[in-house]
């Protein structure tokens, strides 16, 4: 898979492949995988990809199901890169406060907050 | 501060306090703090709260600025609790795939993805 494929296109293709291979993937009815119990997905990327690893190890590879797992691995690579970018630039307090305000604003409007 | 205050109200109050104390907080013009370079804030909670810790250690405490940092500490507690909930329940593959599909769907529509 060329890693040059834009991440947005990669995500779209992965969604389609996930749908295509769902029946094959759920064939293992005894397997248990940690599933987050809230919808703030970005907080749970580590567990999601651990689960993907568990699923991959239990799935017969070949054909486009292999492409699905390759895509997921590229998405993980992208997310790991984003996580690295969290701490790379040490700036002035002013810029940090802008980001903190933005973060709290997003938390206020977009997060699914349980009481 | 009563921890019983709903998190959503806590976030709103914290945004207001942040605005109120901005001048005091930026008084330290030389301090360097990691500022994430993308807007997928949830991926960067660790760095955000490390930055808050650095800022707190450099800020003269007292009055409502102390309340600001107490609030931020409660928000961290809430997020840490959410992170714990990422791996608490082990479910069937079916449920995991539902969550994965939802995650990729959110990534597809809501994430700010750079090429």
């Amino acid at each position: 898979i060329p890693t040059e494929i834009p991440t947005s296109a990669l995500v779209k293709e992965t969604l389609a492949l996930l749908s295509t291979h769902r029946t094959l993937l759920i064939a293992n009815e005894t397997l248990r995988i940690p599933v987050p119990v809230h919808k703030n997905h970005q907080l749970c990327t580590e567990e999601i990809f651990q689960g993907i690893g568990t699923l991959e190890s239990q799935t017969v590879q070949g054909g486009t199901v292999e492409r699905l797992f390759k895509n997921l691995s590229l998405i993980k690579k992208y997310i790991d890169g984003q996580k690295k970018k969290c701490g790379e630039e040490r700036r002035r307090v002013n810029q940090f406060l802008d980001y903190l305000q933005e973060f709290l604003g997003v938390m206020n409007t977009e997060w699914i907050i349980e009481s | 501060i009563p921890t019983e205050i709903p998190t959503s109200a806590l976030v709103k109050e914290t945004l207001a306090l942040l605005s109120t104390h901005r001048t005091l907080l930026i008084a330290n013009e030389t301090l360097r703090i990691p500022v994430p370079v993308h807007k997928n804030h949830q991926l960067c909670t660790e760095e955000i709260f490390q930055g808050i810790g650095t800022l707190e250690s450099q800020t003269v405490q007292g009055g409502t600025v102390e309340r600001l940092f107490k609030n931020l500490s409660l928000i961290k507690k809430y997020i840490d609790g959410q992170k714990k909930k990422c791996g608490e329940e082990r479910r069937r593959v079916n449920q995991f795939l539902d969550y994965l599909q939802e995650f990729l769907g959110v990534m597809n529509t809501e994430w700010i993805i750079e090429s």
Partner: antibody, heavy 111, light 105 residues
């Protein structure tokens, strides 16, 4: 630039190769003849800038990622701006690490 | 300041900061060391107070915490003739120390 008259402006271009300016930050440092090093400012990989407050009103740093070029502009030159001007690469890392330096550009300020 | 030593000797140079360069949150010390040989640009030796840059000989060691830091050359070689600068990485601006000139006897 070599020789520049007082009150004029200095413009230096630092052209990089082997890495991308979208991933690496670039700092500017100067060194007057026979003296020590002075940090001037930085343009971060993200495009943000930070300057030495002593020069903030006269200094601007910009870049063109596609051309792999970083630009320094210093206005209202004074004789004590005479120095060797270096650009230096800072890898994407939370610790400052100026791991590659240019050979430098000499500036003489004289009327 | 300047130091004059013979080849093979151990040398230590110090760098003192007016403020602590230690981040209590992550226990990192924000200080770098550079070597500048005559007619050349500076070269990075140490970052994070004690991490040796790749390719730098292991005779160079950085140590210290808070406000007091040291660069040690365990066995000075003729090619170590240079000026050594420390640089603050904790806060703006990223000030350099005044430099220590190392002379070889």
């Amino acid at each position: 630039p070599g020789l520049v008259a007082p009150s004029q402006s200095l413009s230096i271009t630092c052209t990089v190769s082997g890495f991308s300016l979208t991933s690496y930050s670039v700092h500017w440092v100067r060194q007057p003849p026979g003296k020590g090093l002075e940090w001037l400012g930085v343009i971060w990989a993200s495009g943000g800038t930070d300057y030495n407050s002593a020069l903030m009103s006269r200094l601007s740093i910009s870049k063109d990622n596609s051309k792999s070029q970083v630009f320094l502009k210093l206005n209202s030159l004074q004789t004590d701006d005479a120095a060797m001007y270096y650009c230096a690469r800072d890898p994407p890392f939370s610790l400052l690490r100026l791991d590659f330096w240019g050979q430098g550009t000499t500036l003489t300020v004289s009327s | 300041s300047s130091l004059s030593v013979s080849a093979g000797e151990k040398v230590t140079m110090s760098c003192k900061s007016s403020q602590s360069l230690l981040n209590s949150g992550n226990q990192k010390n924000y200080l770098a060391w550079y070597q500048q040989k005559p007619g050349q640009p500076p070269k990075l030796l140490i970052y994070g107070a004690s991490t040796r840059e790749s390719g730098v000989p292991d005779r160079f060691t950085g140590s210290g915490s808070g406000t007091d830091f040291t660069l040690t050359i365990s066995s000075v070689q003729a090619e170590d003739l240079a000026v050594y600068y420390c640089q603050n990485d904790h806060s703006f601006p990223f000030t350099f120390g005044s430099g220590t000139e190392l002379e070889i006897k």
